[in-house]
């Protein structure tokens, strides 16, 4: 099948990084500078994607990749394949369609990007607060308030590892 | 790649409790928020409540308070819904999703669901 | 902190889908939209208003003003029937999580 396909279309030979020059009697011709082709048989090749303003360069466009951008400190990427960069606030804070603010008592954020999140209620899960909340941290929870009753051992709260952090979207 | 897999089906009576699990692998299972959301049939979507891995803090919908406990064992990377005082009208498809590392973004990966039966 | 959707919207395959999800204030907010077919869990195809995780093809698009957050789905196909759930996250402790009814997208 491969072999009768390429009798009948001689570009399916042309590999990745190559196009199919029609101007030269189907001639596999190498992709221009600043252009690639990430297929065999295509009969053009793509521009490559430019990486500028609060945009940064992650990876170099090459003849059979196209570049790939990430965002300048202080924003970060959204959509496929990072087609927007979005600024960052300080952790504590919410970017709202009008800017960044702080978070409401009883939410916190720890992390530059996303919302306010509210605090854990300990008393669901029959807990009581150990540290309290802030801006920037959750509230941690301790032991039930019947095992903090005299006589009981204390408790010592875990090292803090590390929190939720960002996923590359 | 990531993959949340969860437990298989369960048929339960009223009154009494299950517990779902949820394993997570091809992330660092303690980084990332778990949501439990589901879906009764012929109903929609319905957030039940989040843990989060590291710290083991929760949040559930007022809904479920007082009946649903989300917990989470870090050494084998699997969350966990029990929802207690089962009623005819929690029969539903109970799927488990991540977070994608901050609040206020969509859940990015699903578990398969779990289907849970309650009938006398 | 209720989000309206219409129980479904039917369209021809070729055409365009516009599903929308009504709120107090929705513009405000940060809108997700997830994909739901039978037997299968849900897909987010729109995240944050209006961008696409990837895999998610370009035709599928969203947008989110004054009340009404809209999913847009061009050039229909057969595979796009399913139902869509909108959603938002809010800042209350005792609802923070919040999805749309549902849109059943019904392909003619």
């Known amino acids: 099948f491969e072999r009768t396909r390429s009798l009948q279309d001689p570009c399916s030979n042309c590999p990745a990084g190559t196009f199919c020059d029609n101007n030269r009697n189907q001639i596999c011709s190498p992709c221009p500078p600043n252009s690639f082709s990430s297929a065999g048989g295509q009969r053009t090749c793509d521009i490559c994607r430019q990486c500028k303003g609060v945009f940064r360069t992650r990876k170099e466009c090459s003849s059979t990749s196209n570049a790939e951008c990430d965002c300048t400190p202080g924003f970060h990427c959204l959509g496929a394949g990072c087609s927007m960069c979005e600024q960052d606030c300080k952790q504590g804070q919410e970017l709202t369609k009008k800017g960044c603010k702080d978070c409401c008592f009883g939410t916190f954020n720890d992390q530059k990007r996303g919302i306010c999140r509210p605090w854990t209620n300990c008393s669901l899960d029959g807990k009581s607060v150990l540290v309290n909340g802030t801006k920037e941290r959750d509230v941690v929870c301790g032991p039930s308030p019947a095992d903090l009753s005299p006589g009981a051992s204390s408790v010592t709260p875990p090292a803090p590892a590390r929190e939720p952090g960002h996923s590359p979207q | 790649q990531v993959q949340l897999v969860q437990s298989g089906a369960e048929v339960k009576k009223p009154g009494a409790s299950v517990k779902v699990s949820c394993k997570a692998s091809g992330y660092n299972f303690s980084g990332y928020y778990m949501h439990w959301v589901r879906q009764a049939p012929g109903q929609g979507l319905e957030w039940m409540g989040w843990?989060?891995?590291?710290?083991?803090?929760?949040n559930y919908a007022q809904k479920f308070q007082g009946r649903v406990t989300i917990t989470r064992d870090t050494s084998i990377s699997t969350a966990y819904m029990e929802l207690s005082r089962l009623r005819s009208d929690d029969t539903a498809v109970y799927y488990c999703a991540r977070e994608p590392g901050y609040y206020g973004s969509g859940l990015d990966y699903w578990g398969q669901g779990t289907l849970v039966t309650v009938s006398s | 902190y209720v989000l309206t959707q219409p129980p479904s919207v039917s369209v021809a395959p070729g055409e365009t889908a516009r599903i929308t999800c009504g709120g107090d204030d929705i513009g405000d907010k940060r809108v997700h939209w997830y994909q739901k077919k039978p037997d299968q869990a849900p897909v987010l195809v729109v995240y944050e208003d209006r961008y696409r995780p990837s895999g998610i093809p370009e035709r599928i698009s969203g947008s989110n003003s004054g009340n009404t957050a809209t999913l847009t789905l061009s050039r229909v196909e057969a595979g796009d029937e399913a139902d869509y759930y909108c959603q938002v996250w809010y800042s209350s402790p005792d609802h923070p999580g919040v999805f749309g009814g549902g849109t059943q997208l019904i392909i003619l």
């Open positions: 843990i989060n891995p590291n710290s083991g803090g929760t």
